[in-house]
């Protein structure tokens, strides 16, 4: 045992650079700091075999498996992967340790498996075994959290049935409206599953894992707040738990709260009450209405009444399947080059949607904001005045929705020209789509005013670049115009642009661009 070298096995994670397959290397690229793999002598194996803790990485990740050997003298080595030998070049670090590395670039399924490193030192021979697998994110899920009452306690448990197991946190806020934004100082986060302090203004539970973050707000009716102009609406799917909190504050304890569904008192076991004194000695009462698993007949108007406050109601709608309600007809917009403008989609959906905005095959993050009337809105303003087709896509567990938008930017045409032996063509992307004129420049018409009408072929939209229409006009060459300068002009309501072409033999042509506004 005393002859064995001191072995350290590490994993180095790299910021991804483009490249190919696993290769043995003595000088890995710039990377994260090494991570210890807990190499240990494998018991009951023939020969001296060290094993590193199993490694699991994302597909396309670039990593280095590295061994540091504290043993006297030189070492020689050989990597073996799937019965193939790979070259091995040990070098020595500043502490005079032997360093052997295997770089795996852009991890793929074919590069997953067992990597064996055989080392021969002056004192002994030994093997080091690395196992590398690809993380299977296909099995990952992230489900919206839901609430349960804690057994025998006035507390709520937040549950999210997700893989990998999520971190659950309560997000609490005691202010109103805008100041309850996620990063506001008024927001308090508690990384625990059970919440006892249930008197706050705004209570949400969030679950996060490698797929992202999902939150559920505790639906609340506050009898001290002015009711919304439209009745608040809560959607649930059959089988989901229903939780509504009714909250009221009064100068003393002399008031009570009750829940009714369609004018009938809720059955015992479907509500529980809590009360506390606030700092200014006023009494806060909350009354929860809850159903552990809703059915269709739990649909209706839930009314919270108080002996000292006006009643308020909420409409609970139980659906068999989730939905996304919005108008999916495509919309076209025409804006000026510096006009402020945002696309927006107004929708009603349950469960909450995940959404993206897409332009020219690039996706942009999508934000949603709840409106007072039960609708939500998603806006996209980051178009940078690029004309084309924009796509809004939304989905939840049960429904999908796509809406197309076309953005046209009003601008004067810009003309590009090209010519061949038989024709001359001009292109323009101005909007509104331009009209075309061709003019011949001659002795008789030095200002190029002689219009050409023969052999002209206009195409309103001959190619679509990311939804952007390009108009073109082609002039077929005739003997009458060969050797002359011709001018193509594109004009729309914002101005005119022209390009002058010399129609001689094929080859490069001098173009003179005229900008006439």
């Amino acid at each position: 045992n005393q002859d064995l070298p001191v072995i350290k096995c590490v994993l180095i994670n790299h910021k991804n650079n483009d490249s190919s397959v696993g290769k043995s290397s003595s000088y890995p690229m710039v990377s994260e700091s090494p991570e210890d793999l807990g190499c240990a002598l494998r018991p009951q194996s023939s020969g001296t075999v060290y094993e590193a803790a199993a490694v699991e990485v994302d597909v396309s990740a670039s990593i280095t498996l590295q061994v540091l050997v504290d043993a006297p003298g030189n070492i020689s080595c050989l990597w073996v992967f799937k019965h193939s030998s790979l070259n091995c070049q040990p070098h020595f670090d500043l502490q005079n340790r032997g360093v052997v590395s295997m770089v795996i670039l852009k991890m793929t399924e074919t590069q997953a498996g067992e990597y064996l490193l055989f080392i021969q030192s002056e004192a002994t021979n030994y093997t080091i075994l690395f196992t590398v697998s690809i993380r299977n994110t296909l099995l990952y899920t992230l489900r919206r959290p839901y609430f349960r009452k804690m057994e025998n306690q006035d507390a709520l448990v937040c549950i999210s049935e997700s893989v990998p197991e999520p971190i659950v946190e309560w997000v609490l806020c005691d202010s109103q409206g805008e100041s309850c934004k996620e990063e506001s100082p008024a927001v308090v986060k508690k990384e625990e599953k059970v919440l006892h302090e249930l008197f706050g203004t705004d209570i949400r539970c969030c679950a996060r894992n490698e797929l992202g973050r999902e939150c559920t707000r505790l639906f609340t009716i506050d009898l001290n707040q002015t009711p919304q102009t439209t009745l608040p609406q809560l959607f649930l799917k059959v089988g989901e738990p229903l939780w509504i909190r009714c909250k009221a504050v009064h100068v003393n304890h002399g008031f009570g709260l009750t829940w009714e569904l369609e004018n009938k008192a809720l059955e015992e076991g479907n509500y529980f009450e809590m009360s506390t004194y606030s700092t200014n000695r006023t009494m806060i009462r909350i009354l929860f209405a809850f159903v552990s698993s809703v059915a269709r007949n739990d649909t209706g108007y839930y009314t919270c009444s108080s002996s000292k406050h006006p009643s308020q109601s909420a409409l609970v709608t139980i659906v068999e399947k989730g939905f996304i309600n919005a108008t999916n007809s495509s919309e076209d917009y025409e804006i000026d080059q510096y006009e402020e403008f945002c696309f927006s989609v107004r929708f009603k959906a349950y469960p909450q949607i995940r959404c993206t905005w897409t332009f020219s095959r690039k996706s942009f993050p999508c934000e949603q904001k709840g409106l007072d009337n039960g609708y939500s809105i998603s806006k996209f303003c980051n178009h940078k005045h690029q004309p084309g087709e924009y796509i809004f896509h939304a989905e939840n567990d049960d429904a999908q929705f796509t809406k197309m938008f076309t953005l046209n930017i009003r601008r004067k045409p810009q003309v590009l020209a090209e010519a061949s032996a038989s024709q001359a063509s001009c292109f323009s992307d101005g909007y509104p789509l331009p009209s075309w004129t061709w003019k011949k420049c001659s002795d008789k018409s030095p200002n190029c005013t002689e219009e050409i009408t023969e052999g002209v072929w206009n195409r309103k939209a001959n190619r679509k670049v990311f939804g952007q229409w390009v108009s073109s006009s082609t002039l077929n060459m005739s003997e009458a115009i060969k050797g002359f300068l011709v001018k193509c002009c594109a004009y729309n309501s914002l101005g005119t642009s022209c390009e002058t072409i010399l129609l001689n033999s094929p080859g490069p042509f001098p173009f003179i661009q005229d900008n006439i506004s």
């Epitope: 994993l11 994670n13 991570e35 210890d36 793999l37 807990g38 240990a40 002598l41 494998r42 018991p43 009951q44 094993e51 590193a52 803790a53 199993a54 490694v55 699991e56 990485v57 990593i63 067992e114 075994l129 196992t131 893989v163 990998p164 197991e165």
Partner: antibody
């Protein structure tokens, strides 16, 4: 340099819940298959294993304390969290976290690296 | 649960002595036994794992043997820095269990 560092309250009152955090560095809970356990040691007494979380999120708990213990991890923060509810003066101890590498061939080498421990006193 | 019985619970010895500590498992644990050394106010340190594999960097005077239910830790020639408490741990199955410890003191 591999380290595990325990943190949490020094003093808790009876019936309260103890929450301890083990922050690891020098290895990743995301890319490397490592389990992490919590172990405690009352003053002058033997070591007692409490709970373990595997790399795949599976958990195992001490039979006698199972109803009071919860172990979880946050790989993005390189943290493993232990909660022990309904604390009692007999829970006064030094609490350690320790890592256990998971080898693909299925054998175990037990805890190779430990944190320095954090002393927790339960008293009213 | 598997019970681990460690003996003796305390032991007095002198520098240069050969010392043996025993651990007995209530059921077969194959070779999944580790030995730890702990000094006052410090975390335990792994000496031996898988019954007989010496932890890298641990002096070769420490050795482990045994399989099934009977295991021993031997220190061939005690050094002053070896006076500490020693624990065995079965890591064959969960729940994991430690022995009660052996306090090794200077005679």
């Amino acid at each position: 340099q591999v380290t595990l560092k325990e943190s949490g309250p020094v003093l808790v009152k009876p019936t309260e819940t103890l929450t301890l955090t083990c922050t690891v560095s020098g290895f990743s809970l995301r890319n490397i298959k490592m389990g992490v356990s919590w172990i405690r040691q009352p003053p002058g007494k033997a070591l007692e294993w409490l709970a373990h979380i595997f790399s795949n999120d599976e958990k195992s708990y001490s039979t006698s304390l199972k109803s009071r213990l919860t172990i979880s991890k946050d790989t993005s923060k390189s943290q493993v969290v232990l909660t022990l509810t309904n604390m009692d003066p007999v829970d006064t101890a030094t609490y350690f976290c320790a890592r256990m590498p998971e080898y693909s061939s299925g054998w175990s080498g037990a805890f190779d690296i430990w944190g320095q421990g954090t002393m927790v006193t339960v008293s009213s | 649960d598997i019970q681990m019985t460690q003996s003796p619970s305390s032991l007095s010895a002198s520098v240069g002595d050969r010392v043996t500590i025993t651990c007995r498992a209530s059921q077969d644990i194959s070779n999944y036994l580790a030995w730890y050394q702990q000094k006052p106010g410090k975390a335990p340190k792994r000496l031996i794992y898988a019954a007989s594999s010496l932890q890298s960097g641990v002096p070769s005077r420490f050795s482990g043997s045994g399989s099934g239910t009977e295991f021993t830790l031997t220190i061939s020639s005690l050094q002053p820095e070896d006076f500490a408490t020693y624990y065995c741990l079965q890591h064959n199955s969960f729940p994991l269990t430690f022995g009660g410890g052996t306090k090794l003191e200077i005679k």
